[in-house]
Amino acid sequence: QKPSIGKCSVDIQQNRTKTTERPDLLNCPIYWQQVQEKCLLFSHTVNPWNNSLADCSTKESSLLLIQDKDELTRTQNLIHDKAISFWIGLNFSLSEKNWKWINGSFLSSNDLKITGDAKENSCVYISQTSVYSEYCSTEMKWICQKELTLVRNKVSPDSWL
Amino acid sequence: QKPSIGKCSVDIQQNRTKTTERPDLLNCPIYWQQVQEKCLLFSHTVNPWNNSLADCSTKESSLLLIQDKDELTRTQNLIHDKAISFWIGLNFSLSEKNWKWINGSFLSSNDLKITGDAKENSCVYISQTSVYSEYCSTEMKWICQKELTLVRNKVSPDSWL
């Protein structure tokens, strides 16, 4: 079953003047839900990991990045069906022989217990209770995230001379 | 729909101690070339724009974002064949009726001359001399970028308890 999709809000607002900067994100888009300082989208349909990554990108978001065990638990608590699995933004880097988040950081310890093989074309998904690896070509649901922190875009071309 | 909030990199360098953070990018990966503070990868194969976006994501990079006209010129100088075109990270947002970079910022002026239609499913590519729009489903080469600035990863899970 899916979590609710009510709108959510963020407390901090800032004055924004440049038109090229992104408007403040004052609430989560429809279909998304606020979980602390993130908006999360739990997909209903399924995709291979790479397509899930692309889908989040087209939504100007990222496959889920998990900060710590608390966030993992909070996210898993939103999964209401034991049989449902969701891709997250973690896969195995063959060249570096390590699990790697899509932001480039690595899992440096074994405190996150990933059940399954650590090998080429292995991607990570979460269920209600566990964290698993599976062939990245497998079709699964996925979770996109948008961070609610208000950030200034570094690249906002407004000076084409 | 609400705006989204893709993260961007920061200019300030910080001391790096945690092993889960991304190693300093001191030189460009193999096949990539350094252009000022970026590493660029000019694809050899072709893809629709969306697949190009996904490919850059899987390389932990972005479709090219162009800061100013100087950077456009520098990039075009690296294209040695007049007949070759490359997707960049700019497409038309129908809902916002504006050209939008994949980091969420907009083209706020008409100083960038895009030849072609500004309509749904229009994406932007560059050639040796010009900037064009074309149906996003068209297969073209593309350019990925990695920024050489040293940034601290916000999400680097290293405390799985």
Partner: antibody, heavy 121, light 107 residues
Framework: EVQLLESGGGLVQPGGSLRLSCAAS????????MSWVRQAPGKGLEWVSA????????YYADSVKGRFTISRDNSKNTLYLQMNSLRAEDTAVYYC??????????????WGRGTLVTVSS | DIQLTQSPSSVSASVGDRVTITCRAS??????LAWYQQKPGKAPKFLIY???ALQSGVPSRFSGSGSGTDFTLTISSLQPEDFATYYC?????????FGGGTKVEIK
Amino acid sequence: EVQLLESGGGLVQPGGSLRLSCAASGFTFERYAMSWVRQAPGKGLEWVSAISAAGGTTYYADSVKGRFTISRDNSKNTLYLQMNSLRAEDTAVYYCAKPLDSSQWADFDLWGRGTLVTVSS
Amino acid sequence: DIQLTQSPSSVSASVGDRVTITCRASQDISSWLAWYQQKPGKAPKFLIYAASALQSGVPSRFSGSGSGTDFTLTISSLQPEDFATYYCQQALVLPITFGGGTKVEIK
């Protein structure tokens, strides 16, 4: 122009087969799960089948399971419905439908005009 | 499967009337409900999703409300072009299911 265009309907005898096609244009077809929905004459809407964006996952209504097969060719921007062992109760207008959001199965913001399938001897 | 029950099955109304159609789900579907309008011989038209979000281009006289199991579609001031059949649809789980429809007729 953003559109879906079904074809392949017609008159078929009970036990016969038909293959419906739905040609998509004006949007990134390969990003979206797609569905077939049907409507018997004078009746309401009935969801028939869905397929994931990449085509590897399919679902069917119990009423057509084992007889119908949904497929897609993303290189041709086309959705298909192969209908075998057709019955009189399969007589309906068949619509293909696209969801509003690429993460969803439903919330169909784009429908084709429909193609009529008549099963009769 | 989730059953959706619409009421009334038909309603007679005049131009300018306020019309309310209800849809009841057999189990909690949160806000995963959409509404469609269909005219004879035409494909359905998407009106509302996520229970209350108005699809782009749909007139503001249409509104949706509700959550959980009980939902409402309201047409605040009926226009001649609004005479049609209206369907609710749940988007929570497969199989996707539709309500039986409500026909809005001219009084």
